[in-house]
């Protein structure tokens, strides 16, 4: 497979990963069909500092990231490990609520105005943020 | 000038397989998701498979999945649709066009003129 | 899946005449919505993505606008070689796309 060693176009760098920010919504499903299309995932949160980064670029306004817990446990799309990993919750967060009157609970975690996460219907049209890393092989399978 | 060029088309009874290429030129074929698009005689345009630029990921329209298989070989700038158990409503053109992202936002703003497929004993 | 409705399905006009073509989505699409032009034998042409945004090399005769569900197409007057079918394409489900059903214009 090959390596990608610089952004590309319309992604901003940081940290050895890019980034791309939406300037539109989707629904959590879309949005992580969408970077997966890009050979990206929804952004994984692993530090404080990744956080601020993230959250200057999107300012207040719900932003999908790749956290969920459609299955169970919550899960992070790139397989970081949840339980031992970063959390900026907001106070008795997350909560399940039922009370929204959609159906179901709310197994999808976003970015609040404030930049602490909260989890909410899956399905809110919410902007996101697709995240690659830098010289990580890429997934392309062998040729036949 | 940026060009897509399918092949493969052809006259298969049903049941039977079938293998489409799209030959891309003039393009960094690799940073782009590629899709498939079909019309069926007098019918309009129906979306088929996509697949991410690595290869990586892939997606079908529930009327294939399963029997279709889409692939791509960047060193050869090209993209496959492998075809199977083929039937008779998988009669149509088919294209191959280019997924433009960012600020497209899903748009596919390069198509080749399609092939034929035609299912019929 | 979003149902993508157009109409009419076909129209005849005369060259340049002002055309208006409508789609409507199932749901709420905000403006995740294509135009293409088909014509047989010839390979399909974005002509407006993002419900209002003009692709490069497409003449400003051509427009989009709408957003939410009710989206339109407007050529403002119609030449010779926009004789075709047109077909939106809602690309809020990514990456299930789906397609108006087309209009055909064709010539009076």
């Known amino acids: 497979g090959s390596e990608r060693t610089c952004c590309p176009v319309n992604w901003v760098e940081h940290e050895r990963s890019c980034y791309w920010f939406s300037r539109s919504g989707k629904a959590w499903a879309d949005a992580d069909n969408y970077c997966r299309l890009e050979d990206a995932h929804l952004v994984v949160v692993t530090s404080w500092e990744e956080q601020k980064f993230v959250q200057h670029h999107i300012g207040p306004v719900n932003t999908w990231m790749g956290l969920h817990d459609q299955n169970g446990p919550w899960k992070w799309v790139d397989g970081t490990d949840y339980e031992t990993g970063f959390k900026n919750w907001r106070p008795e967060q997350p909560d399940d609520w039922y009370g929204h009157g959609l159906g179901g609970g709310e197994d999808c975690a976003h970015f609040t105005d404030d930049g602490r996460w909260n989890d909410d219907v899956c399905q809110r049209p919410y902007r996101w943020v697709c995240e690659t890393e830098l010289d990580k092989a890429s997934q392309e399978p062998p040729l036949l | 000038e940026v060009q897509l060029l399918e092949s493969g088309g052809g006259l298969v009874q049903p049941g039977g397989s079938l293998r489409l290429s799209c030959a891309a030129s003039e393009f960094t074929f690799s940073t782009y998701a590629m899709s498939w698009v079909r019309q069926a005689p007098g019918k309009g345009l129906e979306w088929v498979s996509v697949i991410s630029g690595s290869g990586g990921s892939t997606y079908y329209a529930d009327s294939v999945k399963g029997r279709f298989t889409i692939s791509r070989d960047n060193s050869k700038n090209t993209l496959y649709l492998q075809m199977n158990s083929l039937r008779a409503e998988d009669t149509a053109v088919y294209y191959c066009?280019?997924?433009?992202?960012?600020?497209?936002?899903?748009?596919?703003?390069?198509w080749g003129q399609g092939t034929m497929v035609t299912v019929s004993s | 899946d979003i149902q993508m409705t157009q109409s009419p399905s076909s129209l005849s006009a005369s060259v340049g005449d002002r055309v208006t073509i409508t789609c409507r989505a199932s749901?709420?699409?905000?403006?995740?919505l294509n135009w293409y032009q088909l014509k047989p034998g010839k390979a399909p042409k974005l002509l407006i993505y993002t419900a209002s945004s003009l692709q490069s090399g497409v003449p400003s005769r051509f427009s989009g606008s709408g957003s939410g569900t009710d989206f339109t197409l407007t050529i403002s007057s119609l030449q010779p070689e926009d004789f075709a079918t047109y077909y939106c394409?809602?690309?809020?489900?990514?990456?299930?796309?789906?397609f108006g059903q087309g209009t055909k214009v064709e010539i009076k």
């Open positions: 749901q709420n699409i905000s403006s995740y």
């Open positions: 394409q809602q690309s809020y489900n990514t990456p299930t796309w789906t």
């Open positions: 066009a280019k997924r433009s992202s960012g600020w497209y936002e899903d748009a596919l703003d390069i």
